[in-house]
């Protein structure tokens, strides 16, 4: 049941993450314009990773694609990469989790291909989520260099008396959704990984002896993981004497495909 | 056809306050953000402060704040200047202009004018 | 604040002749966001309120007759009457839209010589 409840955690945990991630990524609030030096702009700007907006005080909003691959910051493409890397893999991550999870059958697929689909999608989200946190502090150490660069000639004198205030950006509403987003489908995936390990029964290289104790016969297998014949397989010990010590797994009992509606 | 009529002049005493309306039509009230200038007699143009129909919004010049006062009345699709304390420099034509939703931030549509004289 | 600064105050041009007027702001009014400069001019005639004439430094409003232009950009601004017409005489403004307070240029009154 434990196993079932971090499994599915796990896996809605990621959805919403790798929902964020996306979300972060199509939004146009990467960057936006700092208002400590100029609070009565008349104008605001801020800007995507795929286009720039201006507002303007009528509530007229104007956007700008980025028309030129070539002409853009390698930085920005970094970012971009890291993020479309991070909802690709989160993507896959989510479809092969869906197959993966315990409370769906499908066919007669054993414990140990869900366990490993788990395991995957597990890495998967962890990877998805490391690649979007790291887009989005690698945009975010971008801004702080621009922010302070522009600090330093905030105002640049044209002929004596004309000032031009150049304009800085600050953090954007999509960098908040983005690190949160990514936090989320980085935990989502580490769920993932835990359920895995209590989804597969471990292979050990002890045999099964047999210990006869007075006038009981009680099959016993040493080991505090789980024994069995075979990696995953859905075969029980059979219980020689009701009243007997209970192996492992007699206490984590496997559901068979008629457990489920 | 969009039109902002402005309520009629007005002669006040120095310290006195008086309130100027401007009704709106032909267009969506609630979409435009209305200012005010103003206009001393033989002077330029000069920017009072804007209220936004649809949320209440205001923003003042500050040279203006703690004096005037700008609000409206959905209902009415009408927008009120109020001024306080008046002096004698505060004589001028009042202006309500709407801004313009794709002009660049400028006024696109002017009320006809509200002449308030201040005199004692 | 934006001070904005016409010149010349007066100016006297024959009809069907080319008028100039200019204005510059103490800051700049070109955006960076979008390279659009937030100036526009207004015509007031007297006993009127003023028109709007030209918006974003050089796009002329609807119904503006194609003898008004504007151009310029960052700080330097300028008014083109390419033919003067009688109707023409008036007063005309530059105004900053793009920081508050708004403000305007003291005004050049164009006159028919």
């Known amino acids: 049941m434990a196993v079932t409840a971090c499994q599915g955690l796990g896996f809605v945990v990621s959805l919403i993450g790798i929902a964020g991630i996306i979300a972060a990524t199509c939004m146009d609030q990467w960057s936006t314009q700092d208002l400590y030096n100029n609070p009565v702009t008349a104008v605001f700007n801020y800007q995507g990773l795929w286009r720039s907006c201006v507002r303007e005080s009528s509530g007229f909003t104007e956007c700008r694609g980025y028309f030129t691959l070539l002409g853009l910051p390698a930085m920005l493409q970094a970012v971009r990469a890291l993020m479309i890397v991070g909802i690709v893999l989160g993507a896959i991550g989510l479809l092969v989790s869906i197959f993966a999870l315990k409370c769906i059958r499908i066919g007669s697929m054993e414990d140990s291909a869900k366990a490993n689909m788990t395991l995957t999608s597990g890495i998967m989200f962890i990877v998805s989520g490391l690649c979007a946190i790291a887009g989005v502090s690698v945009f975010a150490n971008m801004l702080v260099t621009n922010f302070w660069m522009s600090t330093a000639n905030m105002y640049t004198g044209m002929g004596g008396m004309v000032q031009t205030v150049q304009t800085r950006y600050t953090f954007g509403a999509a960098l908040f959704v983005g690190w949160v987003a990514g936090g989320l489908t980085l935990i989502g995936g580490v769920m993932m990984c835990i359920a895995c390990r209590g989804l597969a029964p471990e292979e050990t290289n002890y045999k099964a002896v047999s210990y006869h104790a007075s006038g009981h016969s009680v099959a016993y297998k040493p080991g505090g993981f789980k024994a069995s014949t075979g990696f995953g397989s859905n075969t029980k010990n059979k219980k020689i004497y009701d009243g007997g010590a209970r192996t492992e797994d007699e206490v984590q009992s496997y559901p068979s495909k008629h457990d489920y509606v | 056809e969009v039109q902002l009529v402005q309520s009629g002049a007005e002669v006040k005493k120095p310290g006195a306050s008086v309130k100027v309306s401007c009704k709106a039509s032909?267009?969506?009230?609630?979409?435009?953000?209305m200012h005010w200038v103003r206009q001393a007699p033989g002077q330029g143009l000069e920017w009072i402060g804007y209220?936004?129909?649809?949320?209440?919004?205001?923003k003042y010049n500050e040279k203006f704040k703690g004096r005037v006062t700008l609000t409206r009345d959905k209902s009415t699709s009408t927008v009120y200047m109020e001024l306080s304390s008046l002096r004698s420099e505060d004589t001028a034509v009042y202006y309500c202009?709407?801004?313009?939703?794709?002009?660049?931030?400028?006024?696109?549509?002017w009320g006809q004018g509200t002449l308030v004289t201040v005199s004692s | 604040d934006i001070v904005m600064t016409q010149s010349p105050d007066s100016l006297a041009v024959s009809l069907g002749e080319r008028a100039t007027i200019n204005c510059k702001s103490s800051?700049?009014?070109?955006?960076?966001?979008?390279?659009?400069?937030?100036l526009a001019w207004y015509q007031q005639k007297p006993g009127q309120p003023p028109k709007l004439l030209i918006y974003?430094?050089?796009t002329r409003e609807s119904g503006v007759p194609d003898r008004f232009s504007g151009s310029g950009s960052g700080t330097d601004f300028t008014l083109t009457i390419s033919s003067l017409q009688a109707e023409d005489v008036a007063v005309y403004y530059c105004?900053?839209?793009?920081?508050?307070?708004?403000?305007f240029g003291q005004g050049t009154k164009l006159e028919i010589k």
């Open positions: 209220i936004n129909p649809y949320n209440d919004g205001t």
């Open positions: 202009a709407r801004l313009g939703f794709t002009t660049r931030n400028a006024m696109d549509y």
């Open positions: 974003g430094a050089s």
């Open positions: 800051q700049s009014l070109l955006n960076s966001g979008n390279q659009k400069n937030y």
């Open positions: 105004q900053n839209d793009h920081s508050y307070p708004f403000t």
């Open positions: 032909g267009y969506t009230f609630t979409s435009y953000i």
